[in-house]
Interface confidence: low
């Protein structure tokens, strides 16, 4: 209840997160024209990426373009990119949709299609659908520890969500353990009324809200966080508006003294931690 006699002040907060969990990924691997099942283990270093601010990212799906090298090659024949002669290709042109700089030549992409030749990381990335089901769908069972330190400078009061008395093997539950700050990712989605398996395919943005409603009067002191969850990206966006959440990154290596890279289009969940609240004192 609002205590009108109290002097209220907004919370100042810092957040630190740690994600834990291991995923086993099974995918088709093509080597020398032979496709076989490949198994790999993903740990925290493989699926999480440092983000600025109060956010962390967990990769749940990916598309790889392996063995790319900087050279000349035909660009991917996306819609509107095909050509029949060199006139369609403009030397030095950088089409924002393309992956490189055009050389001015129209060259065969495959037996039936021709596209403009580009100077780029080749072969250029194909426009592939995100695998379904998601490759790291087991990320549902990963956990994240959220450390939240808060401060009310006007009241000279500091606290944190983690107390020394808390049990390190707990898992957050809104009824049974609402003060535990280790969250199972699947539970976060369930609480928000979302299907993790579905969102994991294209990615998305999930908000973790930490609300501090602090009464700092010594006779009725209370200052503990309340957690709630909601999806922040627009899940109903039309396909043409690029649904979900993804970005690209590359792993570089040398082969026979030639620099190569594996390009990875990573789909996943960006978790934004939103801390708000007030501290009141007489």
């Amino acid at each position: 209840s609002d205590k009108l006699y109290q002097r209220k002040e907004p919370v100042i907060s810092s957040v630190h997160t740690k994600v834990k969990g291991i995923a086993e990924v099974t995918e088709n691997v093509t080597e020398g024209g032979v496709t076989k099942l490949g198994h790999s283990i993903f740990d925290t270093a493989d699926y999480t990426f440092p983000l600025q601010g109060n956010s962390f990212f967990v990769m749940t799906n990916y598309v790889k373009s392996e063995g790319q090298v900087q050279t000349l090659c035909p660009e991917y024949p996306r819609r509107g990119a095909q050509c029949s002669s060199d006139r369609r290709c403009k030397k030095g042109w950088m089409d924002p949709q393309s992956k490189g700089i055009q050389t001015g030549r129209c060259v065969p992409y495959d037996k039936t299609r021709k596209t403009c030749e580009v100077s780029a990381w080749c072969p250029t990335e194909e426009e592939k659908e995100a695998p379904r089901p998601a490759l790291l769908r087991s990320a549902e069972n990963f956990t994240v520890l959220i450390k939240n330190n808060i401060h009310f400078p006007g009241h000279n009061y500091t606290t944190r969500n983690i107390l020394p008395t808390m049990n390190g093997s707990c898992t957050f539950h809104k009824t049974w353990d609402p003060q535990c700050s280790i969250f199972r990712l699947g539970d976060i989605f369930q609480e928000a009324g979302e299907n993790f398996t579905e969102v994991a395919v294209q990615g998305g943005i999930m908000g973790i809200e930490i609300y501090w409603d602090c009464n700092l009067d010594s006779w009725s002191h209370h200052c503990r966080p309340r957690y709630s969850f909601r999806r922040l990206d627009d899940k109903n966006t039309d396909e043409s508006f690029v649904p979900g959440y993804n970005f690209r990154y590359a792993k570089y290596y040398k082969e026979n003294n030639v620099e190569k890279r594996t390009l990875i289009k990573a789909f996943g969940i960006r978790f934004d931690i939103l801390v708000f609240g007030t501290g009141g004192k007489f």
Epitope: K147, N149, P164, I182
Partner: nanobody, 123 residues
């Protein structure tokens, strides 16, 4: 990368004392440090922790009044003085370090771990 090395473990009679040390390979003055232990067939459990400046200490109920945690930041070393030892204190004692400066009883909170030192209390 911080390496933690425990020493000082051994065999002692019930009622006796022992001091275990934890030396860090790098500067840990801004870290909180903790001790955990694991008895045979049991899960690793919290023993004690100390904040970066030594101002805050926390002890498990089972060791309160008998064990004392301390640190020497100039030597990047943490100590656990164990008095009035009991047979149930028998375990491998692990030193742990957290880059956060405040104390925590959570294993989840500690980034760096030592290999452990065996403490055996005979009756």
């Amino acid at each position: 990368e911080v390496q933690l090395v425990e020493s000082g473990g051994g065999l002692v009679q019930a009622g006796g004392s022992l001091r275990v040390s934890c030396a860090a390979s790098a500067r840990t003055g801004s870290y909180s440090m903790g001790w955990f232990r694991q008895a045979p067939g049991k899960e690793r459990e919290f023993v004690s922790t100390i904040s970066w400046n030594g101002a805050d200490t926390v002890y498990a109920d089972s060791v309160k009044g008998r064990f004392t945690i301390s640190r020497d930041n100039a030597k990047d070393t943490v100590y656990l003085q164990m008095n009035s030892l009991k047979p149930e204190d028998t375990a491998v004692y692990y030193c742990a370090g957290s880059i956060t400066s405040y104390v925590s009883t959570w294993q989840h909170d500690y980034e760096y771990w030592g290999q452990g030192t065996q403490v055996t209390v005979s009756s």
